[in-house]
Interface confidence: medium
């Protein structure tokens, strides 16, 4: 079996980690998905999971996970809020059936929260869709009144993947009929 | 045995229609993702389009979005394409193949193209 | 979307020999890779999913691996019906796309 590498997420308390996982809409729109911890050498511990029905867009929140998700764009999005150097540690986005194994969804992901003031410079991670095999770091300036990973930056223009674009409505039913424009 | 045929291929003329049938037997039609890819004469695969077991989820290739419609009857464990405003680009074997299960926990299960039909031959021609 | 680049396009290689077949793709699609072989007047057969699970049926001198973004298809010794065109294909974004191929022909 493949060991998906771990993308490494470098952050300082008080942010927000915003993780996107892309899922093969084809075999798992129907499936139910979650965010799981890894403790070393403990089981998965499941932190929050998305609600039926897993088919149409949903947001689920508990505690400082939010879970973003929208069959008809294939992903899944992960946010933790107010982290903590104990939030520290090995996650991934899985699809959900016990008591069947959960199935990991693209790259585990290694969160790693130092403390730090709010005069240095610190990597954020701007988690859209992938250009490389790393996720892409940007030098930036932390204050405590922008403590949310994701920025509002152009979209680059090599970016041109497109796991879904929108759903229409088709006799009542979602039926997503999808423009793969690159 | 499982077995997908493809059907209703030809010769048309450009602006021309035509709609492509693939029988499925051999396995439960209607637990899997259906897809057409296409194969231009001595050129690679082409993904084409794909339906989700329920018709739910459809998508398509920018090179035929909005002249192509995939649909799938699972009653009568058929695939279809409807082709419309054909152009001479549109000329190559067309392929329908199963995609994976939706029912990711079955063991079996198969996430890529795991049964191709024969083709079927789409000439675009004036 | 995402580009698949095989290499080389053409691999020229005696029957018992090892053939190592490539695949880039050109942003991460974890392991939802699969390689095809495709011989000529014929569809394609699946010979690979999941970037390394053999198909039903195929033989175990065929194997693949890799993650990410770097793939591998290997034949560890090429018998005369495994001179064909291979295609890699991700299947994690749509659209879904197809790499250029590779003709494995007798040298």
């Known amino acids: 079996a493949i060991v998906l590498e771990e993308e490494r997420y470098d952050l300082v308390e008080g942010q927000t980690l915003t993780v996107k996982c892309p899922f093969n809409i084809m075999k798992y729109a129907n499936s139910q998905k979650a965010w799981q911890r890894l403790p070393d050498g403990k089981e998965p511990l499941t932190l929050v999971v998305t609600q039926r029905p897993f088919t149409r867009p949903s947001e689920v929140h508990m505690g400082k996970f939010t879970l973003k998700h929208d069959p008809s764009e294939a992903m899944l999005q992960v946010q933790m809020t107010d982290l903590q150097v104990t939030d520290s540690g090995l996650y991934r986005c899985v699809i959900y059936h016990p008591p069947n194994d959960p199935v990991v969804l693209f790259h585990p992901v290694r969160l790693v929260v130092t403390k730090g003031s709010s005069d240095v410079f610190t990597p954020v991670i701007i988690p859209i869709t992938r250009l490389t095999e790393r996720p892409i770091l940007i030098t930036t300036k932390y204050s405590p009144s922008d403590t949310t990973t994701t920025r509002s930056l152009p979209k680059p223009t090599a970016v041109v993947s497109s796991p879904g674009l929108g759903v229409t409505i088709i006799n009542g039913t979602d039926a997503d009929s999808v423009s793969t424009s690159s | 045995e499982v077995q997908l045929v493809e059907s209703g291929g030809g010769l048309v003329k450009p602006g021309g229609s035509l709609r492509l049938s693939c029988a499925a037997s051999g396995f439960t039609f209607s637990s899997y993702s259906m897809n057409w890819v296409r194969q231009a004469p001595g050129k690679g695969l082409e993904w084409v389009s794909s339906?989700?077991?329920?018709?739910?989820?459809?998508y398509y290739a920018d090179s035929v979005k909005g002249r192509f419609t995939i649909s799938r009857d699972n009653a009568k464990n058929s695939l279809y394409l409807q082709m419309n405003s054909l152009r001479a680009e549109d000329t190559a074997v067309y392929y329908c193949a199963r995609g994976p299960s939706q029912y990711y926990y079955d063991s079996s299960a198969i996430e890529a193209f795991d049964i191709w039909g024969q083709g079927t031959m789409v000439t675009v021609s004036s | 979307e995402i580009v698949l680049t095989q290499s080389p396009a053409t691999l020229s290689v005696s029957p018992g020999e090892r053939a190592t077949l490539s695949c880039r793709a050109s942003q991460s699609v974890g392991s939802n890779l699969a390689w095809y072989q495709q011989k000529p007047g014929q569809a394609p057969r699946l010979l690979i999913y999941?970037?390394?699970t053999r198909a039903t049926g195929i033989p175990a001198r065929f194997s693949g691996s890799g993650s990410g973004t770097e793939f591998t298809l290997t034949i560890s010794s090429l018998q005369s019906e495994d001179f064909a065109v291979y295609y890699c294909?991700?299947?994690?974004?749509?659209?879904?796309?197809f790499g250029g191929g590779t003709k494995v022909e007798i040298k």
């Open positions: 999941g970037a390394s």
């Open positions: 339906i989700s077991s329920s018709s739910n989820y459809i």
């Open positions: 294909q991700q299947y994690l974004y749509f659209p879904l796309t």
